[in-house]
Amino acid sequence: GLECDGRTNLCCRQQFFIDFRLIGWNDWIIAPTSYYGNYCEGSCPAYLAGVPGSASSFHTAVVNQYRMRGLNPGTVNSCCIPTKLSTMSMLYFDDEYNIVKRDVPNMIVEECGCA
Amino acid sequence: GLECDGRTNLCCRQQFFIDFRLIGWNDWIIAPTSYYGNYCEGSCPAYLAGVPGSASSFHTAVVNQYRMRGLNPGTVNSCCIPTKLSTMSMLYFDDEYNIVKRDVPNMIVEECGCA
């Protein structure tokens, strides 16, 4: 997946620093207080959909083949989304106000692709 | 996830019949020749992003919190994408022209959500 570097408008991964204090989640998340979560942005021209590493590869590739031939679904926009996310350990208060440490999936965007 | 029924413009699953013959893939895919692969379409207003069943839940929820507060990344569109895909068995010619049967992931869109 591409890294956003200011020189491309194609689907890429933008570094993004998340601070739980800014969104008021520091009242239940103990650690980390912040981390690089990143996000995906950019355009998804037809040729980028369904390439290796793209989201839901087989299905995306099939739908893209339909689009390239001018067949339905032609109006659905291809979308720049996370294709690889990673897990991070988090220390937080659970529903019963116990402090717990858990591996939380889908916290960090590692790669982006066109769905 | 919502099913598209012609009455909603929100992110939903649209039934879609895929015929490999129409895209010229019948030269390597033996069976099935066609199937319901479906696709996702519709709008993703802010309140729909990061709800249970949406894509990449934790990360989506965090980014959505930033957006709701007018913080970056505010310009990135939320996107209606598959949140649940299923596997299907496929009989096809491999690289050495042997006929093989495999479970192919991500063939069928089962549910859609906002990323």
Epitope: - | I30, S89, L91, F93, I99, D103
Partner: antibody, heavy 117, light 107 residues
Framework: QVQLVESGGGVVQPGRSLRLSCVAS????????IHWVRQAPGKGLEWVSV????????DYADSVKGRFTISRDNSKNTVYLEMKGLRAEDTALYYC??????????WGQGTLVTVSS | DIQMTQSPSSLSASVGDRVTITCRAS??????LSWYQQKPGKAPKFLIY???SIQSGAPSRFSGSGSGTDFTLTISSLQPEDFATYYC?????????FGQGTKLEIK
Amino acid sequence: QVQLVESGGGVVQPGRSLRLSCVASGFTVSSYGIHWVRQAPGKGLEWVSVIWYDGRNKDYADSVKGRFTISRDNSKNTVYLEMKGLRAEDTALYYCARDKTGDFDSWGQGTLVTVSS
Amino acid sequence: DIQMTQSPSSLSASVGDRVTITCRASQNINSFLSWYQQKPGKAPKFLIYDASSIQSGAPSRFSGSGSGTDFTLTISSLQPEDFATYYCQQSYSSPFTFGQGTKLEIK
């Protein structure tokens, strides 16, 4: 309902030819793969050949490759097995069967081929 | 080619018995295994596919399990009409191959 009926079997001398037919009803052969499977007297099942959905792709067991040819006539909803250079070891009950992604979900009653001098 | 080996080759049992037939593949075939029942003078009948999915119309006393190389067909309570020969078959790759069969006889 789905039905497959084989015909064309009989007694034939070694080296001679025979053509088996498999007439389908209840479905169209152009939408399914059709296999031939044989069973020698008192023995197990042996896959012989298949003609796939598009009619272009065909496959054969090594034991019959170069001698047997599978074909299809969509207008007659029929699949054929042309058998040339028959040998004693080809003696068997020949079944046609409908494909279900490499499995066989419907079978005919079979037609007996006896190769004997 | 993938070799399929069934055991036992023959088996005697009584009505009401629980019976298990095994099938072993010479290499990993995931769960792409089917079972067929054949009665004397009749064509085989499709019973189970994908190792454990029961074919429409097959009695629920038949069940299948296994993946990789080792598979079993189980009849939970033998009925008089179940005495027949059973074949396993792999659909993982062509040529599609059968086991040699297991003949189930009345004790």
